[in-house]
């Protein structure tokens, strides 16, 4: 056998080169046949009615042909025949790679609520071979479940991702990325998560600046409530008591002028949106005016709450004053 060929892998729409090579040439006729055994080239002549085949080189030692705009139907065995005595035959296999036609990502819900599990699907249509789909949430790779559907030698891959969303996922891209031998570089599509979550409430003491409340002083608290959608209602209440007569409420701000001991207690900022409610408590302790002889020690007390809490502890250990937990967020 002195007739040689090489297998060819080509991307759909591109050019395949088929070469029939003869080691010891002797003027014998070289012929190239397609998978249906129809003659494409007889020497340097193309009887086949397919002008996508063009002669690149013809000599006694080589018949080299290009096939442009390759399609999936061109795949198969191409036969080189050398009419020696006896005749010789060798075949080359053309494998056609088809990149996915399009990549579609579909999220079950446009807007999800924190803690909810949502389904995200990504479909890579009509590729050959089947596409590998990878999932990312931001930079973190996640595991999906793929199903492959075959139709006429082409593969459609659908990957399903079940994703439990958290408030931190809001605005984070969910990326569907494909890996395929016909695709160079990154072929991906993404959707940004929109996650609704209940408010996070935080109380900030804006006055007095040193954080110590004494009789006769003023107190200003600001309630910061962040949620999605933005909380529609922010209210101040005094737990287990009436709000002092001299307290002034202005939106998220609570002002109490001329503090006295009767103002001691827990002040609660409540915020709500369509997802839920949350609150944060501020425990006010009004101290005596400063004295000349300071007590030698300071004490810290801790309050336990019934929900998960973020504690902001504001303490002052200056002589003659008692520090306390000032705010508890719920």
């Amino acid at each position: 056998q002195n007739l040689f060929t090489k297998d060819v892998t080509v991307i759909e729409g591109e050019v395949a080169t088929i070469s029939c090579q003869v080691n010891k040439s002797d003027d014998s006729v070289i012929q190239l046949l397609n998978p249906n055994r129809q003659t494409i080239y007889f020497r340097d002549f193309r009887p086949l009615k397919d002008s996508r085949f063009q002669l690149l080189n013809f000599s006694s030692s080589e018949l080299k042909v290009s096939l442009t705009n390759v399609s999936i139907s061109d795949e198969g065995r191409y036969f080189c025949q050398l009419y020696t005595d006896p005749p010789q035959e060798s075949y080359t296999t053309i494998t056609v790679l088809v990149p996915p036609r399009n990549l579609m990502i579909d999220i079950q819900k446009d807007t999800a609520v924190e803690g909810e599990e949502i389904e995200v699907n990504c479909t890579a249509m009509a590729s050959k071979p089947a596409t590998t789909i990878r999932w990312f949430k931001g930079n973190t790779e996640l595991k999906g479940k793929s199903e492959v559907e075959e139709w006429s030698d082409m593969y459609t891959v659908t990957s399903q991702l079940m994703l439990k969303v958290h408030k931190e996922d809001d605005g984070v891209p969910v990326i569907c990325q494909v890996e395929h031998p016909a695709v160079t570089g990154n072929l991906q599509t993404q959707r940004y998560l929109e996650v609704q979550y209940k408010p996070q409430v935080h109380i900030q003491m804006t006055y007095p600046l040193q954080g110590l409340t004494r009789e006769g002083d003023a107190l200003e608290l600001t309630c910061e409530a962040i949620g999605k959608p933005q909380p529609v209602m922010v209210t101040w209440v005094r737990v287990d008591d009436e709000m002092p007569q001299h307290a002034v409420l202005s939106g998220p701000n609570l002002f109490i002028n001329n503090l006295n001991k009767t103002d001691n207690g827990t002040y609660r900022c409540e915020a709500s949106n369509i997802v839920g409610k949350a609150h944060s408590d501020y425990m006010l302790y009004v101290y005596d005016p400063p004295t000349t002889i300071p007590p030698p020690t300071t004490t810290t007390t801790t309050t336990t709450t019934t929900t998960t809490t973020i504690l902001t502890i504001i303490t002052d250990s200056r002589a003659g004053e008692e520090g306390s937990i000032r705010a508890v967020d719920h």
Partner: antibody, heavy 115, light 108 residues
Framework: EVQLVESGGGLIQPGGSLRLSCAAS????????MSWVRQAPGKGLEWVSV???????YYADSVKGRFTISRDNSKNTLYLQMNSLRAEDTAVYYC?????????WGKGTTVTVSS | SSELTQDPAVSVASGQTVRITCQGD??????PSWYQQKPRQAPVLVFF???NRPSGIPDRFSGSASGNTASLTIAGAQAEDDADYYC???????????FGGGTKVTVL
Amino acid sequence: EVQLVESGGGLIQPGGSLRLSCAASGFTVSSNYMSWVRQAPGKGLEWVSVIYSGGSTYYADSVKGRFTISRDNSKNTLYLQMNSLRAEDTAVYYCARGTWYMDVWGKGTTVTVSS
Amino acid sequence: SSELTQDPAVSVASGQTVRITCQGDSLRHYYPSWYQQKPRQAPVLVFFGENNRPSGIPDRFSGSASGNTASLTIAGAQAEDDADYYCSSRDGNDDRWLFGGGTKVTVL
């Protein structure tokens, strides 16, 4: 000059045998596909047989088993051995270079099968 | 075994264009070759393949093919084009060759 010259035709009785020759000049018979084509009086062209450069041979159904195509490379000559001749084999026999396209033809030799 | 079908005869005024057709299953895949034969002469190849005209053949001879039909066109026929014309092709994938029945072209 590229040329083909047939010979060997004549009058032959039904059942008889005849060998046609086709001498080539200007090219090598063994490196080419060589065909025999015939034309009955007042009729069209009919392909008879082919020999490929590698030596493979093929025949029209009407002559299969009766005719044999061959060549002598040293003489650069093509042959058609015709046995069991019938009246319907009466024709002008042409040898030609090629199959997909026959670009060189001889002038032909006449074979008449008659009693 | 398939066959190639040609119109038996066609006439054309000198200087006019004439088209000779050839029909057959093998022509779905292959281009035919076309031969001109004048009385008491051997056939002569005038056109073959997609667009091949042998040297010495005038450029008024051209070929085309679509589906299972191929055509030989003589644009501006001359008196010397008065002859029989044959199409030829391979018989499918078999190592047999076909000729059409021939078309007699008369140049008036």
